[in-house]
């Protein structure tokens, strides 16, 4: 007789990352009987929702249901029907919605109301939509990468099961770059966290962690670009903005109303004698870098040391995983290799930004022009943020690991968020019972 496979005793969870530029749906899976073990949850699917971030739907909320349909239907297909009702669905909105809420709490609630109504029509266990704080975003990103790297496991190994592993229990710091904010999170070495807002205390798997985190709102790559444009147009003599952060020959018309739409440009807002201006690229890395540095106020620091804008930052410690847009941008520029020094990265960026726009378009014919045009700025911004913003040096650069996935799961805040909300990270080390570990080799 044929052996019948026993039904898998597994559980699923869904997290939607409602970012400023787009929404992604992640499906996670884990063995039901090992919920409290570290490293057992893994990503089985990522579905990128077609269209912009949810904050862009403020004037067309009736389209939100259709917008979410494809990825929610994909979840319906991937997860067995028998599991639908038990599968929790969480939506976390990040800095794009934080900015909308700053403009109008009612408009933010309007968007989230329709998102919640739309998601509740699916057969899953919908657990609500909320705007997560920058602190949560940083903390959950840190939990995700360390969970996936096996840093919370008390069993020390003589071999490495994942890349980047340094075979010790030192946690990795987390560097997250989005479209509207960026987060830095790590365990400082014997350093007091001087500002309470930046201090987190965790007890995970029987160990205490004192974690530093900060989220810089408006310093995601897209909002940083809007800031830079708003700053530079102030001193332009006419409606032409010669911009070193775009390739030579590149031209784009920008509406002043779009420029001042975001709260991130309020500090640079002024009455201009024109309604539109034209960006003309001149492709100069050094000048672009200098322009970006003007976004970081380093003249004021009420602590022993700061990142920028008067925000406390302890001395950097250990290895860091840089993910989300840090990874996507550097991957596009082919600069994610561990062997590429900071000096080499700078050299490559100089060459890349100086390439004529027509040449770039030909070389990367398959890439949407909107994204393609911004890689020079984004790459330069990443260097500026890491070096001048967070005080990485040419030497400590080698401690930055640009990470897309770990063990098949995307690096980002979503996994940590789900682990927390489903109570799958115990404060204490779970007792090993022969039964629950009977399948271990």
């Amino acid at each position: 007789t044929q052996n019948k496979a026993l039904p898998e005793n597994v559980k699923y969870g869904i997290v939607l990352d409602a970012g400023s530029s787009h929404t992604s749906l992640y499906i996670y899976k884990w063995p039901a009987e090992k919920e409290n073990d570290t490293g057992v949850v893994h990503q089985v699917e990522e579905c990128r929702v077609k269209g912009p971030g949810i904050s862009k739907f403020v004037q067309k909320v009736n389209e939100i249901g259709i917008y979410l349909t494809d990825c929610m239907e994909r979840a319906r297909e991937v997860i067995p029907r028998s599991q639908h009702q038990e599968t929790p669905v969480y939506l976390g909105a990040t800095a794009g919605m934080r900015l909308l809420r700053m403009e109008s709490e009612e408009l933010a609630d309007r968007v989230l109301d329709v998102v919640e109504r739309s998601l509740s029509n699916y057969p899953f266990d919908f657990q609500g939509a909320r705007i997560i704080t920058g602190q949560e975003e940083g903390a959950y990103g840190w939990i995700t990468i360390n969970y996936l790297l096996g840093k919370f496991s008390q069993k020390t190994r003589w071999f490495s099961i994942v890349p980047y592993e340094t075979n010790n229990q030192e946690t990795f710091g987390a560097l997250d770059l989005g479209g509207a904010s960026t987060q830095v999170t790590f365990v400082p070495q014997n350093q007091t966290i001087e500002s309470p807002d930046n201090a987190l205390q965790f007890r995970l798997y029987g160990k205490d962690y004192n974690v530093y985190t900060h989220s810089f709102l408006c310093y995601g790559k897209d909002q940083a670009l809007w800031q830079k444009l708003a700053k530079d147009i102030q001193v332009a003599s006419n409606e032409i903005l010669r911009d070193p952060c775009f390739h030579p020959g590149y031209k784009k018309v920008v509406n002043v109303s779009d420029l001042y739409k975001t709260p991130c440009t309020k500090r640079f807002e002024m009455t201009l004698p024109f309604q539109q201006f034209e960006i003309q690229g001149i492709g100069n890395y050094q000048q672009c870098h200098q322009s970006i540095l003007e976004l970081f106020n380093t003249s004021y620091c009420p602590y022993s040391q700061c990142a920028f804008n008067g925000i406390f930052l302890p001395p950097l410690q250990g290895d860091f995983g840089a993910f989300s847009a840090f990874y996507f941008v550097m991957k596009f520029l082919n600069l994610t290799s561990e062997k590429v020094s900071q000096e080499k990265v700078t050299e490559m960026m100089k060459k890349f930004c100086a390439q004529p726009w027509e040449e770039i378009k030909t070389s990367y014919a398959g890439v949407k022009e909107k994204y393609l045009s911004e890689y020079c700025f984004s790459g330069t911004y990443i260097l500026s943020l890491l070096l001048q913003g967070y005080h990485f040096t040419a030497d400590s650069w080698e401690h930055i690991h640009f990470i897309g996935k770990i063990q098949g799961s995307d690096a980002g805040w979503t996994l940590g968020y789900m682990l927390n909300l489903t109570n799958m990270i115990p404060a204490e080390q779970p007792l090993s019972t022969p039964l629950s570990h009977s399948t271990y080799v």
Epitope: V61, N62, I64, G65, E106, D109, R110, L112, D113, V114, E116, R117, S118, S120, F126, Q127, G128
Partner: antibody
């Protein structure tokens, strides 16, 4: 002061459909959600679904998915609840209620008088 | 869905006495909880929202407390018009769910 006035009692045959209306007067109709709640004889309250008239977006309890349709007509400030494939267990008083807290605040501040729907062969 | 459980099912109280009704949620609903009063042949009426805020026109003898999963409705001194069925409802998550009700009857 907002008032909700519902259509009259109905007697229906099993397998048929019923459509109950709920007309709002004396306040903003579009922005606030309208929920439908039913109560079987001698039983508690059971939420069926809701709509924001402003956007025409409805959501339903899983139990009623595919059998209930909630719509709204902004021009007449009227919400409708249609329940199909009726069975005897659907005999109940059906209430419409306004979610009076605004977006994401679904407390039911104003109720209609109720519509008795009897399903009997 | 969030399951709401009310206790007791029936409460016998003399007029002028205090009545305490309980409501428990199967998971935290924060303060997104409402209490309703329903008299025979009538539609429910909102008494309390946000766990502790009285709706307009509701007498001060009605008070709500609690947050998270445990909630209480207190009627400080029962009047004859207060004998009715009381329902709690969570409105944090869809579907909106009600407790089974507590009938407050004359002792």
């Amino acid at each position: 002061q907002v008032q909700l006035v519902q259509s009259g009692a109905e007697v229906k045959k099993p397998g048929s459909s019923v459509k109950v209306s709920c007309k709002a007067s004396g306040g903003t109709f579009s922005k606030y959600g309208i929920s439908w709640v039913r109560q079987a004889p001698g039983q508690g309250l059971e939420w069926m679904g809701s709509i924001i008239p402003e956007f025409g977006i409805a959501n339903y309890a899983q139990k009623f998915q595919g059998r209930v349709t909630i719509t709204a007509d902004e021009s007449t400030s009227t919400a409708y609840m249609e329940l199909s494939s009726l069975r005897s267990e659907d005999t109940a008083v059906y209430y419409c209620a306004r979610e009076s807290g605004g977006y994401r605040d679904h407390r039911l501040g104003v109720w209609g008088q109720g519509t008795m729907v009897t399903v009997s062969s | 869905e969030i399951v709401m459980t009310q206790s007791p099912a029936t409460l016998s109280v003399s007029p002028g006495e205090r009545a305490t009704l309980s409501c428990r949620a199967s998971q935290s609903v924060g303060s997104n909880l409402a209490w309703y009063q329903q008299k025979p042949g009538q539609a429910p009426r909102l008494l309390i929202y946000g766990a502790s805020t009285r709706a307009s026109g509701i007498p001060a003898r009605f008070s709500g407390s609690g947050s998270g999963t445990e909630f209480t409705l207190t009627i400080s001194s029962l009047q004859s018009e207060d004998f009715a069925v009381y329902y709690c409802q969570q409105y944090l998550l869809w579907p909106l769910t009600f407790g089974g009700g507590t009938k407050v009857e004359i002792k």
